[in-house]
């Protein structure tokens, strides 16, 4: 597995990571850490593993966390109720 750097699919990344679109260069994907408590997220970001090519810059939240709305159009990783 690729621990950091370029990737195409989740299976190429290490545990606790997903293959998300680079914030800097949208044409490449990089192994990115899954969302920690308080991190920004999107509720429709693909769960891990996803076999296709992601479009979001963010990964889903870590297990035990959920991507919850905190205000209009703002979502963060919070502890699941």
């Amino acid at each position: 597995a690729v621990i950091t750097g370029a990737c195409d699919k989740d299976s190429q990344c290490g545990g606790g990571m997903c293959c998300a679109v680079s914030i800097w260069v949208k044409s490449i994907r990089i192994c990115t850490p899954m969302g920690k408590l308080g991190d920004s997220c999107h509720p429709l970001t693909r769960k891990v593993p996803f076999f296709g090519r992601r479009m979001h810059h963010t990964c889903p939240c870590l297990p035990g966390l959920a991507c919850l709305r905190t205000s209009f159009n703002r979502f963060i990783c919070l502890a699941q109720k």
Epitope: P43, K47, F51, H56
Partner: antibody
């Protein structure tokens, strides 16, 4: 060649349940999610929900929550939609649709031929 | 739920002329600088067919006379030179928020 072949038309009484099948072929079934969409006669499209054919995780339109169940049988590469407590307004053509490799664009690139479900007393 | 409103409900365009369909979302369907809007074509008696995904990306095999544009709440599907085989109903669909919702459809006919 990717194909989604759905079960035949159904006529049901109000309050009954219906189960529609969608048999996939021509691709690796577990690598793609499957959506269900319906279309009432002469009306537009309405998204019902989808399932991961890899692990069976489902996401439903809240409008149908409690009445709809989407399942898969990986051994036969078949997806199922079950809708209970049928009412006349559930009369529609029900489509299964494979979600293509578009990440979070959730775009459906192959569709079944549709199954007409008629709810009538 | 996000409400998608298409305009016009129907339009008649001469062969070879441009057809423009608009879709307005009740709230933004953008995220991370991308627009989460798809367009489908449905001919009578057939299932829908994917034309455009993520607002402006042409699906493989779709003629390049079709194009999509827009961001935020306002989107457009353009057929640059209408052909007879383009007679159909066209639907926009947002996929930025669950439930995914479709517009009511726009019927395109030949004048």
């Amino acid at each position: 060649e990717v194909q989604l072949v759905q079960s035949g038309a159904e006529v049901k009484k109000p309050g009954a349940s219906v189960k529609v099948s969608c048999k996939a072929s021509g691709y690796s079934f577990t690598d793609y999610d499957m959506h269900w969409v319906r279309q009432a006669p002469g009306q537009g499209l309405e998204w019902i929900g989808y399932i991961s054919c890899y692990n069976g995780a489902t996401t439903y339109n809240q409008k149908f929550k409690g009445r709809v169940t989407i399942t898969v049988d990986k051994s036969t590469s078949t997806a199922y939609l079950e809708l209970s407590s049928l009412r006349s307004e559930d009369t529609a053509v029900y489509y299964c649709a494979r979600e293509g490799n578009y990440g979070e664009a959730y775009a459906m690139d192959y569709w079944g031929q549709g199954t007409l479900v008629t709810v009538s007393s | 739920d996000i409400v998608m409103t298409q305009s016009p409900d129907s339009l008649a365009v001469s062969l070879g002329e441009r057809a423009t369909i608009n879709c307005k979302a009740s709230q933004s369907v953008d995220y991370d600088g991308d627009s989460y809007m798809n367009w489908y074509q449905q001919k009578p008696g057939q299932p829908p067919k994917l034309l455009i995904y993520a607002a402006s990306n042409l699906e493989s095999g779709v003629p390049d006379r079709f194009s999509g544009s827009g961001s935020g709440t306002d989107f457009t599907l353009t057929i640059s030179s209408l052909q007879a085989e383009d007679v159909a109903v066209y639907y926009c669909q947002q996929i930025n928020e669950d439930p995914f919702t479709f517009g009511q459809g726009t019927k395109v006919e030949i004048k």
